[in-house]
Every structure is written in structure tokens, then in C-alpha cells.
């Protein structure tokens, strides 16, 4: 098959409103530059400065800088996954790329040309994938996870996930890997999604799917997009394995009732 499982509806991070900002600790006293925390973070933290190690899951590089593997890095993908990139001058990166790239192709070939490729700066939209950082002493976020609901980081052990409730019964879930397989598919999807959200440089504006799970890790019968202001989110009904049930949807004008199904 072309793919394994679906992402489902989009759930965006909570806005950085006054309540969220009130929960922030004071920003570090000595900082060359303050930037927002990675992921859904609303609070301010120190930007990484030129020459500091960086990667997909570390804090952001400062303005005008871009995280890149060192030029002589034999395993550039691995370097970024492991937080062994370096914050370098973004314009220098562009100049180097222009120097290294072949001449632009002839007109008519442009649709798949090198020139069409987005340069993917640190400000590009993203939600990341492979979470690991080699050396905790270089990466203060090594033992933290982004909390979606309140938009701030919470201490946890190694990569043990600390969930907060987001209309999902996550509080009683243990994240120990030995117990993980005892839970249903919704729980596994949620944990994998939250793993994606750890140690991010930036947040995808398209958001991330956080499914609505019951305590056993199966899908609750009613799944909804979040409300947008006064506009109610789109809702639909699923079975315990997350498969949508035909005929049970609402465009927001009226509530959807998911009858004769598993636990809500």
C-alpha cells in the first residue's frame, strides 16, 4: 500500500495568550538574543549563537543564523538528528550553496529545477521526526518535552512523556515502553505524535493531529477539530480503531451524536 496510517484532523497549538504567558518563568537574565521556545512554546529562551551546536530538536539559532552540519561532516543527516549541527551565518550558507550548485537549467525545465526547491530556513514550517540528542550537557532540552496544552516545557525523565489533558484521557497513561504495547492504536498514534513534537526548532502552521483517546488507548467515538473563535470545530464519529463512520459528521452548525458505539 502507499501508506500505513492516516494523520486525521488537524489540531493547532494553543495561542500564546496572556494566561499562557503568565505561566512563563522570567527569561534568562544574560542573553544575546531572546527567542520563543521550540514547538508550541510561548515562553522566551536564549537563542543559540553563531558556532553553537544545534539540530532538529535543539533551541533555535539566533536571527540571521541557520543550523547546518559542518562542511566536512560525513553523516550530515545524522549530525542534525543528533544535534551536532552548527549555527552559521545564513547569508554565508546561501552564498556557499550558490557557489556549489550547477548553473540553472534551461527554460522549460524549471518546474523540477534546483531553483524551485525551497531553501528551508530555520523559520520554515515543520514538525519533526527522529528525536534524539547525543549529549545532554550541550542540549538543555534533552530531558524535556513540549506540552501542547499550556505551551511550555515540563521536566521529565529521559524521553518519558509527560502528558497534560487536552480533552483526551492521557493523565493515567504510563509511557514506559514495556507497557506501551498494551494500549490501543489511538494511544500509540498519540504517543508517536507527541514524540514528533519534542525538541522542535519551529512549529508547523498546519498543526499536528492529537487524537481523542480513551483510557485504554482506543479512539473515543467522537473526534473533533478545535473551535476557531466562536466557530465550532468540525466533528465526526469513529469506531474504536479510528475508522470514520459514514453519515456521522457535522459542519459546526449542530452537534454530532455518535450513538450505539464504544465508550465516549
Amino acid at each position: 500500500g502507499a501508506s500505513s496510517a492516516g494523520l486525521g484532523p488537524v489540531v493547532r497549538c494553543e495561542p500564546c495568550d496572556a494566561r499562557a504567558l503568565a505561566q512563563c518563568a522570567p527569561p534568562p537574565a544574560v542573553c544575546a538574543e531572546l527567542v520563543r521556545e521550540p514547538g508550541c512554546g510561548c515562553c522566551l529562551t536564549c537563542a543559540l549563537s553563531e558556532g553553537q551546536p544545534c539540530g532538529i530538536y535543539t533551541e533555535r539559532c539566533g536571527s540571521g543564523l541557520r543550523c547546518q552540519p559542518s562542511p566536512d561532516e560525513a553523516r550530515p543527516l545524522q549530525a542534525l538528528l543528533d544535534g551536532r549541527g552548527l549555527c552559521v551565518n545564513a547569508s554565508a550558507v546561501s552564498r556557499l550553496r550558490a557557489y556549489l550548485l550547477p548553473a540553472p537549467p534551461a527554460p522549460g525545465n524549471a518546474s523540477e529545477s534546483e531553483e524551485d526547491r525551497s531553501a528551508g530556513s530555520v523559520e520554515s514550517p515543520s514538525v519533526s521526526s527522529t528525536h534524539r540528542v547525543s549529549d545532554p550537557k550541550f542540549h538543555p532540552l534533552h530531558s524535556k518535552i513540549i506540552i501542547i496544552k499550556k505551551g511550555h516545557a515540563k521536566d521529565s525523565q529521559r524521553y518519558k512523556v509527560d502528558y497534560e489533558s487536552q480533552s483526551t484521557d492521557t493523565q493515567n497513561f504510563s509511557s514506559e515502553s514495556k507497557r506501551e504495547t498494551e494500549y490501543g492504536p489511538c494511544r500509540r498514534e498519540m504517543e508517536d505524535t507527541l514524540n514528533h513534537l519534542k525538541f522542535l526548532n519551529v512549529l508547523s502552521p498546519r498543526g499536528v493531529h492529537i487524537p481523542n483517546c480513551d483510557k485504554k488507548g482506543f479512539y473515543k467515538k467522537k473526534q473533533c477539530r478545535p473551535s476557531k473563535g466562536r466557530k465550532r470545530g468540525f466533528c465526526w464519529c469513529v469506531d474504536k480503531y479510528g475508522q470514520p463512520l459514514p453519515g456521522y459528521t457535522t459542519k459546526g452548525k449542530e452537534d454530532v451524536h455518535c450513538y450505539s458505539m464504544q465508550s465516549k
Epitope: S3, S4, A5, G6, L7, I56, R66, C67, Q68, P69, R75, P76, L77, Q78, L80, L81, G85, R97, R117, S118, A119, G120, S121, V122, S124, P125, S126, V127, S128, S129, T130, H131, R132, V133, S134, R158, Y159, S177, K178, T181, D192, T193, N195, H196, L200, N201, V202, S204, R206, V208
Partner: antibody, heavy 118, light 112 residues
Framework: QVQLQQSGAEVKKPGSSVKVSCKAS????????TSWVRQAPGQGLEWMGG????????EYAQKLEGRVTITVDESTNTAYMELSSLRFEDTAVYYC???????????WGQGTLVTVSS | EIVLTQSPLSLPVTPGEPASISCRSS???????????LNWYLQKPGQSPQLLIY???RRASGVPDRFSGSGSGTDFTLKISRVEAEDVGVYYC?????????FGQGTKVETK
């Protein structure tokens, strides 16, 4: 529903190049490692290389270095794999795959058969 | 690069019976964060591979609980508690610890 949709089968002559596309839909693209994996007839899986669009960073398997180029167009969420100086032994099904949360390929394209024949 | 060696290469199975596949790595796949970066895939005839197990023991979404993974360091095992007819195909282990990511040679599982 996350889907990786690949371009159609190709028949190429030895020494020529082929460019296969992989369009991602329904999910997030920018910081996943989009990889290319190939499978010769009756053989196993071989990782060819990958790209992280957000960092515009690529890495290739050593045996293919210099012949393979992986690029992306983030505006269309499409990854491309170009293989040059084709040889008979490059005849294979080429898959694009997205590395998920913990260095595993959670989504695969349907595969593109590239036949190198004179 | 890390070399993965699977055994057996061919495994005739009887539906309802258990089955086991081994994957040995040329170096430890245990990361300093405590995770073993070893994944298992099943490629059914004529299809793309599909993820079964990641991080040595975590079942991917939608994978039946008859599949389980175990092991740490260099030795890993995929077990099927009760083989079903739909489980036939080629099983691959893959390491995601370091690039280049590499696969085992594959184990062909077919019914007797």
C-alpha cells in the same frame, strides 16, 4: 490520511538518467527525513539516501555517491530522486519513505519500477 | 556501516503456530538515550513494506498484537505468537541508529 504518491514506471537506456518524484499529502513534510529505498528484482531493500527539507541537508549511501541526487520542492511537498549514469543493475523498484518519530519509515510510497534496458 | 544479519532466510510456517525471526547487528543499536533503534517491516507480495515494530519492541499503529519485538544491543527477535495466512511475505529488520540506515537480507515466511 498521509500518502506518498510516486511517479509512474520508467524504461531507460544505460548511461542515461531517471528522475522519480514523490508527492506527500495529508501530513507534515519539512523536518521529516524523506528517504529513497530501492529493491532490485528478487532482492532486499537498500537505503539510497535522504533529505531533511527544513535544513536542505542531504546524505547518500556511499556506493551511490556522485550518481544520486535527492531534492525537494517544499511548495508542493514533493521529493525527487535523480539517478544518473544508469546501469543494468539499477533496474529496481524505487520507494520513497518518510522516517517517522524515531528513525523508522512509517509511510511508504507505492514504488516506481525503473527498468534499464538497451 | 552497520551490517544486519537475519536468520533464518526462509521460514515455512503452519497457521496457528508460533514463528520467530532473529536479527543480529554488527554493532550495538542501543543509543545513549536508552532506545534501541531497530525496526521490523513486513513486505507482502506485490506491496510496499509496512512498519511492524520500531524501537525494538513498540508495535506500530494498527499492527495486531500477535506481533512482538524484543532484544537489545546486538541481538533482536521478532515473534508471531500465532501465524495467520495473511502474515506471509518477507520480513526485514532495519537499523535507524546511524546513517547509512541499513536493512537485513530479509526472511521469507511462507505457509507449509
Amino acid at each position: 490520511q498521509v500518502q506518498l504518491q510516486q511517479s509512474g514506471a520508467e524504461v531507460k537506456k544505460p548511461g542515461s538518467s531517471v528522475k522519480v518524484s514523490c508527492k506527500a499529502s495529508g501530513g507534515i513534510f519539512s523536518t521529516y527525513v524523506t528517504s529513497w529505498v530501492r529493491q532490485a528484482p528478487g532482492q532486499g531493500l537498500e537505503w539510497m539516501g535522504g533529505i531533511i527539507p527544513m535544513f536542505d541537508t542531504t546524505e547518500y549511501a556511499q556506493k551511490l555517491e556522485g550518481r544520486v541526487t535527492i531534492t525537494v520542492d517544499e511548495s508542493t511537498n514533493t521529493a525527487y530522486m535523480e539517478l544518473s549514469s544508469l546501469r543494468f543493475e539499477d533496474t529496481a523498484v524505487y520507494y520513497c519513505a518518510r522516517a517517522g518519530g524515531l528513525s523508522h519509515f512509517d509511510y511508504w510510497g507505492q514504488g516506481t519500477l525503473v527498468t534499464v534496458s538497451s | 556501516e552497520i551490517v544486519l544479519t537475519q536468520s533464518p532466510l526462509s521460514l515455512p510456517v503452519t497457521p496457528g503456530e508460533p514463528a520467530s525471526i532473529s536479527c543480529r547487528s554488527s554493532q550495538s543499536l542501543l543509543h545513549s538515550n536508552g532506545n534501541n533503534y531497530l525496526n521490523w517491516y513486513l513486505q507482502k507480495p506485490g506491496q510496499s513494506p509496512q512498519l511492524l515494530i520500531y524501537l525494538s519492541s513498540r508495535r506500530a499503529s494498527g499492527v495486531p498484537d500477535r506481533f512482538s519485538g524484543s532484544g537489545s544491543g546486538t541481538d533482536f527477535t521478532l515473534k508471531i505468537s500465532r501465524v495467520e495466512a495473511e502474515d506471509v511475505g518477507v520480513y526485514y529488520c532495519m537499523q535507524g541508529l546511524q546513517t547509512p540506515w541499513t536493512f537485513g537480507q530479509g526472511t521469507k515466511v511462507e505457509t507449509k
